[in-house]
């Protein structure tokens, strides 16, 4: 039977090395065996390149195309082929369809003043246009309570977020994930980073007097544990000293 495209290709670029196009066929298709996506930069002397698509689902195909470091003027001509049959033809401008790379290496560290320091890495090298354009969304959720979640927008430059332990339930396990977008490029959101999980422990300090540091913190690495021990010792002494004066 004839091969038809149900939903035409939708493409996004990470604006550094890769563009990804996805489309849906009208019936289950072996994408890599039956289809080819050709792409060519509209630039004098540019060669034609071919992308072999892969299946995402039975009838959904996806093609990842290596591109050079994108610039605003770049426009690609795309042609979707089934053998000698041209199924679809269109153009794609990476700078107008940006989906940032996923932020990486999300970690949670105990910090001074009963805060958790969430850190992640900017997925772009400093010389890339997007490096200084990214803002982030951090989602923090209670692993055992779907109603208990918070969303933080990080609009400043550094890929960090300070989170007061008191804003989270004590003794609960929390997961955080982060995604990025580039406002000036009117981008879509990146995919979410893998989640990182930690155990939150917070009680009002009045209840801590005379109590040992609780065990749940042992889930932290030794460096983090030392940091929080020192921070809590200092704060405990300050707190105690404060009460003596009054």
């Amino acid at each position: 039977g004839s091969v038809k495209v149900l939903h035409e290709p939708s493409c996004f670029s990470d604006y550094i090395s890769t563009s990804v196009c996805q489309w849906k066929m009208d019936h289950p298709t072996n994408c890599s065996a039956e289809l080819r996506l050709s792409y060519q930069l509209d630039f004098m002397g540019s060669e034609n390149h071919t992308c072999v698509p892969e299946n995402r689902e039975d009838s959904v195909c996806v093609c990842s195309m290596p591109i050079d470091d994108a610039v605003e003027a770049d426009v690609y001509q795309l042609d979707l082929w089934a053998g000698q049959q041209l199924l679809w033809s269109g153009s794609f401008q990476p700078s107008k369809h940006v989906k940032p790379r996923t932020p990486g290496n999300l970690t949670v560290h105990p910090n001074i003043s009963h805060t958790w320091l969430l850190m992640w890495t900017n997925p772009y090298p400093t010389e890339n246009h997007l490096h200084s354009e990214l803002t982030y969304m951090v989602n923090v959720s209670n692993d055992n309570d779907p109603e208990d979640f918070k969303v933080y927008n990080v609009t400043y430059m550094g890929p960090t977020l300070r989170l007061a332990a008191s804003t989270l339930k004590s003794g609960a396990s929390y997961s955080a994930r982060v995604r990025a977008w580039a406002q000036t490029y009117n981008s879509t959101w990146s995919d979410w980073s893998p989640s990182t999980t930690w155990l939150n422990y917070y009680e009002p300090w009045e209840q801590h007097l005379g109590k040992p540091i609780p065990n749940p913190l042992l889930g932290l690495d030794s460096t983090g544990l030392n940091d929080i021990f020192e921070a809590q010792k200092i704060e405990w002494h300050e707190h105690h000293h404060h009460h003596h004066h009054h």
């Epitope: 002397g45 540019s46 060669e47 034609n48 390149h49 591109i67 050079d68 003027a73």
Partner: antibody
Framework: EVQLVESGGDLVKPGGSLRLSCVAS????????MTWVRQAPGKGLQWVSL????????YYADAVKGRFTISRDNAKNTLYLQMNSLRAEDTAVYYC??????????????????WGQGTLVTVSS | DIVMTQTPLSLSVSPGETASISCRSS???????????LDWYLQKPGQSPQGLIY???KRASGVPDRFSGSGSGTDFTLRISRVEANDTGVYYC?????????FGQGTKLEIK
């Protein structure tokens, strides 16, 4: 040493044909687009045609479109210009030159960085 | 087609002085930040052309730093400082951005 050597220039009558060759050495020929540029006696430079590294893309000046064909044999490191239906105004020295690097997605450009010595084509009755 | 216009068409300069040649294009040659597709070539008497400057300001291999290119968009300049007798010839600007590639008319530099 990077070098281009043209040949094939001759005296030909109007309406006649000629094939110019340009043999390249000293660089990876297939990775680069190649260009033909001509210069009529006492005149300036005029671009004629360009071909991508694989030979898959060709471009022509309006003055020669439909009459001239650029091609290449990467196995022989040779660029060609087939010239048909020649006219008096095609009289010129024809130069081949190394153009942009086309093995990358966006061609990398370093100018026409090597030129041949030129071959003279004279179209006259 | 992109039209390239050079000024002046001829120039006479004493040795040691600076020569400036202007080139204007009918369309912007700025493809992306820092990438102006404009070249300068020199054709010495009886010789093939040779590349001097590409992408507006980058010197071709082996070209002395007396030669410098500047400008962006549609207006470009070639400067030759401390001119020498060997610099005699015709200077051409060229745009390699769009087909057809187009050259300026040429500027003839004469050393007094």
């Amino acid at each position: 040493e990077v070098q281009l050597v043209e040949s094939g220039g001759d005296l030909v009558k109007p309406g006649g044909s000629l094939r110019l060759s340009c043999v390249a050495s000293g660089f990876t020929f297939r990775d680069y687009a190649m260009t033909w540029v001509r210069q009529a006696p006492g005149k300036g430079l005029q671009w004629v045609s360009l071909i991508s590294g694989s030979g898959g893309k060709t471009y022509y000046a309006d003055a020669v479109k439909g009459r001239f064909t650029i091609s290449r044999d990467n196995a022989k490191n040779t660029l060609y210009l087939q010239m048909n239906s020649l006219r008096a105004e095609d009289t010129a020295v024809y130069y081949c030159a190394v153009d942009r690097l086309t093995k990358t997605i966006r061609p990398q450009y370093y100018g026409l960085w090597v030129w041949g010595q030129g071959t003279l084509v004279t179209v006259s009755s | 087609d992109i039209v390239m216009t050079q000024t002046p068409l001829s120039l006479s300069v004493s040795p040691g002085e600076t020569a400036s040649i202007s080139c204007r294009s009918s369309q912007s040659l700025l493809y992306s930040i820092g990438y102006n597709y404009l070249d300068w070539y020199l054709q010495k008497p009886g010789q093939s052309p040779q590349g001097l400057i590409y992408l507006g300001s980058k010197r071709a291999s082996g070209v002395p730093d007396r030669f410098s290119g500047s400008g962006s968009g549609t207006d470009f300049t070639l400067r030759i400082s401390r001119v020498e007798a060997n610099d005699t010839g015709v200077y051409y600007c060229m745009q390699p951005l769009q087909s057809p590639l187009t050259f300026g008319q040429g500027t003839k530099l004469e050393i007094k």
